[in-house]
């Protein structure tokens, strides 16, 4: 649909989902809650010093299938889980860091809880 001028409503409209956000809150978030037409996520990754850092927030519908795909990256330990079944569902997501491995992986499963 067009955004400038004479367009009519798309159907069906997606229902907005509220997610908890931490270290990943957009400028419009209030009380650490963000809104999305896509998924809530929680992610754990290592920072530069090797400490685990947990972030959570909203992923837009566009591209979220790719972002929620837990594809291992060489020399980077990271895990992401996504959900849509209820508002703030990512409060109950607890991804864990994958074990250190030498060989690279090409693809991984989509983690939808």
């Amino acid at each position: 649909k067009k955004e400038d001028g004479e367009s009519t409503a798309p159907t069906p409209r997606p229902k907005i989902l509220r997610c908890k956000c931490h270290h990943h809150c957009p400028e419009d978030s209030v009380n650490n809650i963000c809104s999305t037409d896509g998924y809530c996520f929680t992610m754990i990754e290592e920072d530069d010093s090797g400490m685990p850092v947990v972030t959570s927030g909203c992923l837009g519908l566009e591209g979220s299938d790719f972002q929620c795909r837990d594809t291992p990256i060489p020399h980077q330990r990271r895990s992401i889980e996504c959900c849509t079944e209820r508002n703030e569902c990512n409060k109950d997501l607890h991804p864990t860091l994958p074990p250190l491995k030498n060989r690279d992986f090409v693809d991984g499963p989509i983690h939808h809880k």
Partner: antibody, heavy 117, light 113 residues
Framework: QVQLQQPGAELVMPGASVKLSCKAS????????MHWVKQRPGQGLEWIGE????????TYNQKFKDKATLTVDKSSSTAYMQLINLTSEDSAVYYC??????????WGQGTALTVSS | DIVMTQSPSSLAMSVGQKVTMSCKSS????????????LAWYQQKPGQSPKLLVY???TRESGVPDRFIGSGSGTDFTLTISSVQAEDLADYFC?????????FGGGTKLEIK
């Protein structure tokens, strides 16, 4: 067709409580948010809060968090708003309104609440 | 809270004339992730409930006559009625849905001469 049915009027005493209803039909109740909006005579519109009927998740305008409580009955596709400790300032028309995103695509006809002894 | 300011508060126009009314927000309603403005316009005829006219600042709701045109971006928005009709007598409200609490402008009352 989508309909949000509200009682036309309610008269209550100061200090009392009231539970306003909004019966939804013509769509899947749990697929949309339900909001409540206040309009005093000759004044603008004030958003009170929202409820997602699918998981009963609520967000309130801080101004109304001690005044209003939002609930739903999924079996009858009805949303409710309870208002407590009523004063003349609560006399207004109260609308329920549906949203998918956070703009309101269908509105009830409104309930005119009068708080008077 | 985001403050919405509408002007003028009232105006009287003759049938067939072009009408423009303004809505200004105290902060930008443009979301960077999708480049959409989170602003809606409503029409409230005397004794009736509000009716959605426009959302995302410029997308007309289905069934709304094409004489109603929403425009603007960021903090400045306009609702234009290209050729006003007698049945357009109403109050017009803008609403931001960028950040909770969702807030409305004070309204513009359109009278027909």
């Amino acid at each position: 067709q989508v309909q949000l049915q509200q009682p036309g009027a309610e008269l209550v005493m100061p200090g009392a409580s009231v539970k306003l209803s909004c019966k939804a039909s013509g769509y899947t109740f749990t697929n949309y948010w339900m909001h409540w909006v206040k309009q005093r005579p000759g004044q603008g519109l004030e958003w009170i809060g929202e409820i997602d009927p699918s998981d009963v998740y609520t967000t309130y305008n801080q101004k109304f968090k001690d005044k209003a409580t939002l609930t739903v009955d999924k079996s009858s596709s009805t949303a409710y708003m309870q208002l407590i400790n009523l004063t003349s300032e609560d006399s207004a028309v109260y609308y329920c309104a549906r949203s998918g995103w956070d703009y309101f695509d269908y509105w009830g006809q409104g309930t005119a609440l009068t708080v008077s002894s | 809270d985001i403050v919405m300011t509408q002007s003028p508060s009232s105006l009287a126009m003759s049938v067939g004339q072009k009408v423009t009314m303004s809505c200004k927000s105290s902060q930008s309603l443009l979301k960077s992730n999708n480049q959409k403005n989170y602003l809606a316009w409503y029409q409230q005829k005397p004794g009736q409930s509000p009716k959605l006219l426009v959302y995302f600042a410029s997308t007309r709701e289905s069934g709304v006559p094409d004489r109603f045109i929403g425009s603007g971006s960021g903090t400045d928005f306009t609702l234009t009625i290209s050729s006003v009709q007698a049945e357009d007598l109403a109050d017009y409200f803008c609403q931001q849905y960028y950040s909770t609490p969702w807030t409305f402008g004070g309204g513009t009352k359109l009278e027909i001469k």
